[in-house]
Each structure stands twice: as C-alpha cells, then as structure tokens.
Interface confidence: low
C-alpha cells in the first residue's frame, strides 16, 4: 500500500468508527501499526483467499479486487456495508448475512491496524486471476464471541483512563497526532441512520449480529441451509468461510464461476475466539463468478463517500453467520471443502424490504418508448459491466432472509475462522468478498 492508502485506510476506519449509530461511548481511535502491516503484507504475498491460520491474536479482514488495482475506499465500503445487517442492541447479524467485517472495523477496543496488499496472478481459492489482495490485521482483535463491538452511549463517555476525546473517538493522551490519519477525505460524510439494525449506507446494504453473541459466532448449526433460507449478499453476494481454523480457500479447488467478470474480492473478518471456539458446519465451495467489466477513467478518489455503496466497482459483503448444511449445499454450486465452511450466496438487503420508493420520475416525459418484439427464441444477453464476487458466510442457525449486500471478504478473528462461505457474489467491477 502506498503511504496515502495507509493513511486513507486509517482515516476511513476512524471515520466509520466515529460515526457509528447508535453512537459509541468507548470507541478507541485507530492508528497504523507497521508490524501489523508487515504481517498482513507477508500473508498477502501468499495469495490465498482465506484467513491466515497463523494470525494468532489478530483480527483480520480481507478484500480482493481484480483487474482494477487496490481501492481502499471500496474495501472499506464493502466491509462497512455489513452494518445494515447488524443489530447492535441485539448484537445480532441478520440470518445468513455477514457482519464480521463491519464489526471488526467498529470494534471499540481495536486500536491498531496494519494492512498490506499484493498482486496475485492467481489467488488460491478463487477462479479469478490477476487479483490485488488486501489483508488488514487488527489488534486487539475484534469479533470476540459474545461481545458487542462497542458500548452505546455518549461519544467518549467511557474512554479508558489515559485517553481523551477527539472527534468522538478515544485517543491516548499525549499521543502525537497520528501521521497516518488523513483528514476526512469523504466529501459527503456518510450520514448513518439512528439504528444499527436498519442502518445502511444510502446505497448499500449492511449487516447485523445475533443478540449477545454475533450470529456468526453461534456454535450450533440448526436447521438446514435451504437455498431460500440463505440470504444473498450484494451487489452487491459474498460469503465467508467458517472453520475452527481459518480455512484456506484452497482447501479444495474452489468452484469455477462460469461468468467471466473481473471482480473485487472482499474477505470478511472473522471473529476472534476469546472464548470458547465455535464449530461450524461443513462447508461447500461455491463457484465464484467472474466479471469482465472494463473500468475506465478510474480515478482513485479517496473522497468516495462511505455511504455510497454503489461504487463503480461493486463488492460484496457477507454476514458472518453460518448457515445450516442443507442451505450450504443448496447455495453452493461446487463442492466445498470438508472444513466447516459454508458457501452460500448471500445478498444483504440494502434496506428494509418494505421501504420502497418511487422508482420512476416520468414527470414531463412524454416521449413514447417502443416496446421490443418478444421473439420466442431465447434472448441472448451479453454480460457486460464489471462484476463483484464475494464470499459470504454465515454461522449455524443463521437461517433467514438474506439481504442484498456487498461481500467484503473474509473477516476473521484470532485463531479461528468464523463464517462459512455463504456464496459468491458478483458485482459490477467484480468484487469478490468472502468470509473465512
């Protein structure tokens, strides 16, 4: 990552952390950690689409993008997008959704982040080629089983001793201004809704965790993962791999995605197992679709509003919940590795399904549109536009309606992989996100 990308990564993390809703009373200011960055970079070089089994006591978020180069704002958006599926008060993630990336990003006690990216001609675990893999490691790790990411309350009202309030975040007293922190680059600061449960970036769809314990941390897998039961993750359909040990997407040959579409791979962060480990259902691999969008005039503008999940490069985020085996199988088109991973396409809803707005504005539009003829022959449509791939995982018992969302990639906590791969999601410039 360039120095600017590092700074942007920290700035965006802090921006999202400062703007959580409900507000956080104990949110620590995050700073860059070169050791974590080196660790992340080293793992990124391995070109494996799966969480680092050797990450130890480090949280981890993965993101990958094909053909377009790293896009920090997009990675952040994908991860943060899961917030729509996360219910802070209940500490639950919507069934079938991934929330681990989001919860890691806003994990109050996490105060150090280090990321590294590497261009992989072949990323082990996915069919895509020429992928830029981003790995972010966190300390202390987030996604601790049974814990909420942060305490709701007046900003900074519960800052630890030795910390003072700055921009709604608890920053160590006497600490020099973080050189890595960038000034707010988001021209339009995301205005999140009041409740985590339903908040969603204006254009995206986030996630949620289960009461008390993030759904993706649930150890028991109940019910079957019926196709219908599995939520699909969005624009923007990601999945996460859940395994007691961070699964490597390469465990088995990942399913091939027939559509050739460049994609962005976003990996979900896995919850850390500070407490008892969680067992996950057997996982199956789901092919990752490819997209072949041409991205032009791609100016890396860090000022991309985190709220706008509709970026040219679509990415997927998945909830960190595990789905029942039946659903895993139903969702997976390819055989999944015997590991406790579940691949299910999840597509987080961008908002409450009921909240639909007028879709057209025909005012003043009087020109007549001619309807096409409808031949009986099969209509052929050339897939155009980039697509995003995302792996989303959910934990056992996380059967429920899925909501459209972006699959951000793998999200894992120290030592364990939580969400099974729920599914591969394809989005405009392909964004592949998976939780491992």
């Amino acid at each position: 990552l360039t120095d600017e990308e590092k700074r942007l990564m920290v700035e965006l993390h802090n921006l999202y952390r400062a703007q959580v809703s409900p507000t956080a009373s104990d949110m620590l200011h995050m700073r860059w950690d070169e050791e974590l960055a080196a660790f992340a970079k080293a793992y990124a070089r391995q070109c494996v689409w799966g969480h680092n089994k050797e990450r130890g006591r480090r949280g981890e978020n993965l993101f990958a993008i094909t053909d377009e180069g790293m896009d920090v704002p997009l990675a952040m958006e994908e991860w943060h997008h899961e917030r729509e599926h996360y219910n802070l008060s209940a500490a639950t993630c919507s069934p079938g959704q991934m929330c681990g990336h989001y919860t890691q990003v806003v994990w109050a006690k996490t105060e150090r982040i280090g990321c590294g990216s590497h261009f992989c001609e072949k990323l082990q675990g996915v069919e895509e080629t020429n992928i830029e893999l981003l790995v972010c490691n966190y300390e202390p790790p987030g996604n601790v089983k049974g814990k909420r990411p942060y305490q709701e309350g007046t900003p900074c009202s519960q800052c630890p001793s030795g910390y003072h309030c700055k921009n709604s975040l608890c920053e160590p007293i006497g600490s020099p201004e973080d050189a890595q922190d960038l000034p707010y680059l988001v021209t339009e600061a995301p205005s999140f809704r009041a409740t985590e449960a339903s908040d969603s970036r204006k254009m995206g769809t986030p996630s949620s965790l289960a009461t008390g314990i993030p759904a993706f941390l649930v150890t028991e897998v109940s019910g079957s993962l019926a196709t219908k039961a599995l939520p699909a993750v969005e624009t923007q359909a990601p999945t996460s791999l859940a395994t007691k040990d961070p699964p490597s997407m390469a465990t088995e040959a990942p399913p091939c995605v027939t559509t050739e579409v460049p994609s962005i791979l976003a990996a979900h962060s896995l919850p850390s197992l500070d407490e008892e480990p969680v067992t996950f259902p057997k996982s199956t691999h789901v092919p990752i679709p490819k997209s072949a969008d041409k991205v032009t005039d791609k100016t890396k503008v860090p000022s991309r509003s985190p709220e706008n999940s509709l970026d040219p490069k679509m990415s997927l985020t998945g909830a960190r919940e595990l789905l029942p085996h039946a659903q895993e199988e139903a969702e997976a088109e390819a055989e999944l590795p015997p590991s406790s991973e579940v691949l299910a396409s999840v597509f987080p809803a961008q908002d409450k399904p009921g909240e639909l707005q007028a879709t057209l504005d025909h005012t003043g539009h009087t020109s007549s549109k001619s309807l096409p003829n409808f031949p009986n022959t099969s209509a052929t449509a050339n897939a155009t536009g980039g697509r995003a791939l995302a792996l989303q995982s959910s934990l056992p018992g996380a059967e429920g309606p899925d909501k459209p969302s972006v699959v951000s990639g793998l999200n894992s906590g120290p030592g364990h992989v939580w969400g099974p791969l729920l599914g591969l999601l394809l989005l405009p410039p392909l964004v592949l996100a998976g939780i491992f």
């Epitope: 997008h81 069934p95 079938g96 339009e188 969603s200 204006k202 254009m203 769809t205 196709t227 219908k228 039961a229 599995l230 939520p231 699909a232 993750v233 969005e234 624009t235 923007q236 359909a237 027939t258 559509t259 789901v286 679709p289 969008d293 032009t296 005039d297 706008n308 509709l310 040219p312 679509m314 990415s315 139903a330 088109e333 299910a344 396409s345 999840v346 597509f347 987080p348 809803a349 961008q350 908002d351 409450k352 399904p353 707005q357 879709t359 050339n382 897939a383 536009g385 995003a388 791939l389 995302a390 309606p401 899925d402 459209p404 972006v406 599914g423 999601l425 394809l426 989005l427 405009p428």
Partner: antibody, heavy 121, light 111 residues
C-alpha cells in the same frame, strides 16, 4: 454467454394471475441476484422486484408489493414472478435482469428480451 | 426520496458528440448510477456504472465512444462520434434503500 429468456407472458383479465419465468444460462445462477423490470407501452423502465442469489431476500416496488411474488429455483436456473390481482396498469413488457452482483445493488446486466403481459378485459 | 431526472429528449448530428444528463435528487449526490441503452424494439442494455467521482465501469462490448463523468449530483453519459445505431432511449438508474430507481429516460435522436 449469458442468456436470459423470459416466458409466460400473455393476456390476462384484471384481477387475474399470471406467472412469468426467466430461464438463465451462461453464469453461476445462484451467485447472482435477479430482478424484474417492466416497461409499460410507450413508457420508461420501472423496477419491479429483486431477489437475492439464494432467494432469501426479496425487494419489491410499492406498486406491486403484496400482489407480486418473486422467487427462484436455483436448481433450474430460473427466476419467477408470480403476479396476482393484476391491474390494467400492470400491462407491460417484463424484463428479467441479472444483477451485476449478488448484493442486489440493482445494477442490471445483462437484460433479457422481455415477455409481454397484457391485463385487459 | 431518491429520484433521477433526465431530459425527455436530445439530439445531435451524426459524428458529433452528445452529452446526456441524469440528475440525482437532493441528498443523493454521492450515489453511483448505471446507464442503460434501449434501442427501438429491443430490451435494455447495460452501458456502464458511473460513480460520483467520475470513474466508471463499462459493460462488455460497449464502444469507447461511450464514456461517463460526474459533477456533483449530475451524472453524464457522453457519446462521441454519434452513430445511427446510437438512436435509442437512455436510462440512468441507481439503487437506493431496497429499491432500484430509473430516470424517465432520454430519447436520443441522431440528426
């Protein structure tokens, strides 16, 4: 090559029901959200509904909520739209569209050629 | 409410350039949109996804003549060297809170 073929359109009386289908091929069907977008004669495009890749999440336009039901059978690579309590204003060409991604962000690509549904007595 | 506004019609000479505009409603200027083309008697065709920063992802097979740009709440589709086959209705579209929204469409007529 991605192909989307709609079928099931036809003439139906007001208050009646009809199910249109969209058979997909050329891509990993279960990994993509699918949507239905309609276009009334001489009018613009109107989004109708979207369903996630797994089928677990669905979204509807207010104009059809409670009357239309989107579903999919991933084993058959087919998405359906069950339309009931049809009204004259539902008359339109119904297009099936594949989402750019499972996230169902509503980026439609590609589109099918449509199937015409006419609601008239 | 998320609304996309487009001019009903536009025209330009063959070989010339034309710039179609799609305006996002107040409060939604950061939204990305997609441009779709619908030629007479045909189904829509995805052209590109255009982000608020002007970057865009074009669909497969979309000629280089098609490009997108952004300025504030305005999203533009520029077609250079206009061809007769470019005669079509152009729709901008975005995705909001659980819904997809289309603009009313612009009917482009090459002269």
């Amino acid at each position: 090559e991605v192909q989307l073929l709609e079928s099931g359109g036809g003439l139906v009386q007001p208050g009646g029901s009809l199910r249109v289908s969209c058979a997909a091929s050329g891509f990993t069907f279960s990994s993509y959200a699918m949507s239905w977008v309609r276009q009334a004669p001489g009018k613009g495009l109107e989004w109708v509904s979207t369903i996630s890749g797994s089928g677990g999440t669905t979204h509807y336009a207010d104009s059809v909520k409670g009357r239309f039901t989107i579903s999919r059978d991933n084993s058959k690579n087919t998405v359906y739209m069950q339309m009931s309590s049809l009204r004259a204003e539902d008359t339109a060409a119904y297009y099936c569209a594949k989402d750019l991604g499972l996230r169902a962000q509503g980026w439609f690509d590609p589109w099918g050629q449509g199937t015409l549904v006419t609601v008239s007595s | 409410q998320l609304v996309l506004t487009q001019s009903p019609s536009a025209s330009a000479s063959l070989g010339a350039s034309v710039k179609l505009t799609c305006t996002l409603s107040s409060g939604h200027s950061s939204y990305a949109i997609a441009w779709h083309q619908q030629q007479p008697e045909k189904g829509p065709r995805y052209l590109m996804k255009l982000n608020s920063d002007g970057s865009h992802s074009k669909g497969d097979g979309i000629p280089d003549r098609f490009s997108g740009s952004s300025s504030g709440a305005e999203r533009y589709l520029t077609i250079s060297s206009l061809q007769s086959e470019d005669e079509a209705d152009y729709y901008c579209q975005t995705w909001g809170t659980g819904i997809a929204v289309f603009g009313g469409g612009t009917q482009l007529t090459p002269l």
